[in-house]
Interface confidence: low
């Protein structure tokens, strides 16, 4: 009979850019841990062997960190990181318990185009100026017909390339796992989340290798 | 479509080294990792190790380490495996496959370890 | 080290049955990280189902797999004469990271 509980942070919010600490604690089991498997949706993160150590899946290594103890580091937080994550303790004589964390990455409050936050006062006053300096610019370049063919010509190629990026850059966050083409996937959508490629969805494995960080710590509580 | 094609069987002398290439082709090679597989009558089917060609990443088995060593060239799609310290018992066929679910093989490439 | 007992080890059927091949795991392991394979003499393994019940692409919907924990089926539910191989179930997660059953021959009675 399974005993055990696995104890998570639950559901957690970090910001865009920054880290998080996914932790999972068993207790109320005197059962013998032998791996823990750290997944998000169907793609293995990394995985704590109570013989081998650590494995990071090398398509996360630069932004996944193992630890502290059984918990795992996310750095260089991005919105496609948003989604459900998953500590899969693999015991005996238990057999498996799993635990869910669900993590929403937030954009930075100046880089959010949403209404959903609020722009703090500084970025108001930034943005004021700004609109304020373009319009000024706008109307003394006017006067010159020369300059104003120029500014419209560069007006022109900026709309381009915000058109451009917008391509890659979609406001509602994919979801984790959602990072399907193979070919020719732009760095923005596909290099932020899977590291240096972008591996098909069914990939699973994505090769562990192996850290050579001492042997994972495997402690329960009986109580 | 998907091949991997692997390079002709090998006849060694004990102590030798030899190493075999799985070259790939029909996919875009630094997105999946390239597993090797060896295949005995009395072992069956061994898990070698494996490399994610995007970052040269690698993994092995641990009763691999020091016998199988994994190397890939990304300009020519091509996934290596050398074998040192050659024994009778490395006499086997060795099997590349294509990632974490093996969907699709190598021809195989046999090696023979005789004096 | 997860070991993969695969029973039994030789299976006599005739084409028409339906064939049951088991697996089982020494501990229990991810339903996602289960597949089947086909070989057949002089030939490389062929993947037929990954993720313990998905057809692999081209494999004819006669196979089927199931299971969870530490027990997996492979059930094909009329053998046709192309049938007749071994065949071998394949778990990754465990240490080492990937290893195979020693494979189920399925002959002809």
């Known amino acids: 009979m399974m005993t055990g509980t696995i104890e998570t942070t639950g559901n957690i919010s970090a910001e865009k850019g920054g880290s998080i600490i996914l932790q999972c604690h068993l207790s109320s089991t005197t059962a013998q841990v032998t791996q823990v498997n750290w997944e998000q949706q169907d793609q293995l993160l990394a995985i704590c062997n109570a013989d081998l150590g650590w494995h990071i899946s090398p398509s996360f290594k630069d932004r996944v960190a193992p630890g502290p103890g059984l918990g795992l580091t996310l750095q260089s937080l991005t919105v496609n990181d948003t989604g459900e994550y998953f500590c899969i303790y693999h015991t005996y004589p238990d057999g498996t318990y799993t635990g869910r964390i669900f993590l929403e990455v937030l954009e930075s409050s100046v880089a959010e185009h949403g209404a959903r936050f609020q722009i703090p006062l500084l970025g108001a006053m930034a943005a004021t100026l700004v609109v304020i300096c373009t319009a000024v610019i706008v109307v003394v370049a006017l006067t010159r017909k020369k300059k104003a063919l120029r500014i419209h010509s560069v007006e022109g190629d900026l709309r381009r390339k915000s058109a451009g990026q917008e391509e890659w850059s979609p406001s509602a966050p994919s979801p984790p796992g959602s990072c399907v083409q193979a070919e020719a996937a732009p760095a923005g959508l596909c290099g932020e989340q899977r590291g240096e490629d972008c591996a098909e969805l069914h990939d699973y494995f994505n090769v562990l290798s192996y850290r050579s960080l001492g042997n994972c710590s495997f402690f329960t509580e009986t109580g | 479509q998907v091949q991997l094609v692997q390079s002709g069987a090998e006849v060694k002398k004990p102590g030798a080294s030899v190493k075999v290439s799985c070259k790939a082709s029909g996919y875009t090679f630094t997105s999946y990792n390239v597993h090797w597989v060896k295949q005995t009558p009395g072992q069956g089917l061994e898990w070698i190790g494996t490399i994610y060609p995007g970052n040269l990443a690698t993994s092995y088995n641990q009763k691999f380490k020091g016998k199988a060593t994994l190397t890939a060239d990304k300009s020519t799609s091509t996934v290596y495996m050398e074998l040192s310290s050659l024994r009778s018992e490395d006499t086997a066929v060795y099997y590349c496959?294509?990632?974490?679910?093996?969907?699709?093989w190598g021809q195989g490439t046999t090696v023979t370890v005789s004096s | 080290e997860i070991v993969l007992t695969q029973s039994p080890g030789t299976l006599s059927l005739s084409p028409g049955e339906r064939a049951t091949l088991s697996c089982r795991a020494s501990?229990?392991?991810?339903?996602?990280?289960l597949h089947w394979y086909q070989q057949k003499p002089g030939a490389s393994p062929k993947l037929l189902i990954y993720n313990t019940q998905n057809l692999a692409s081209g494999i004819p919907d006669r196979f089927s797999g199931s299971g969870s924990g530490t027990s997996y089926t492979l059930t094909i539910s009329r053998l046709e004469p192309e049938d007749f191989a071994v065949y071998y179930c394949?778990?990754?997660?465990?240490?080492?990271?990937?290893?195979f059953g020693a494979g189920t021959k399925l002959e002809l009675k």
């Open positions: 501990s229990s392991i991810s339903s996602t990280y």
């Open positions: 496959a294509r990632s974490g679910t093996m969907d699709y």
């Open positions: 394949q778990q990754f997660g465990g240490y080492p990271l990937i290893t």
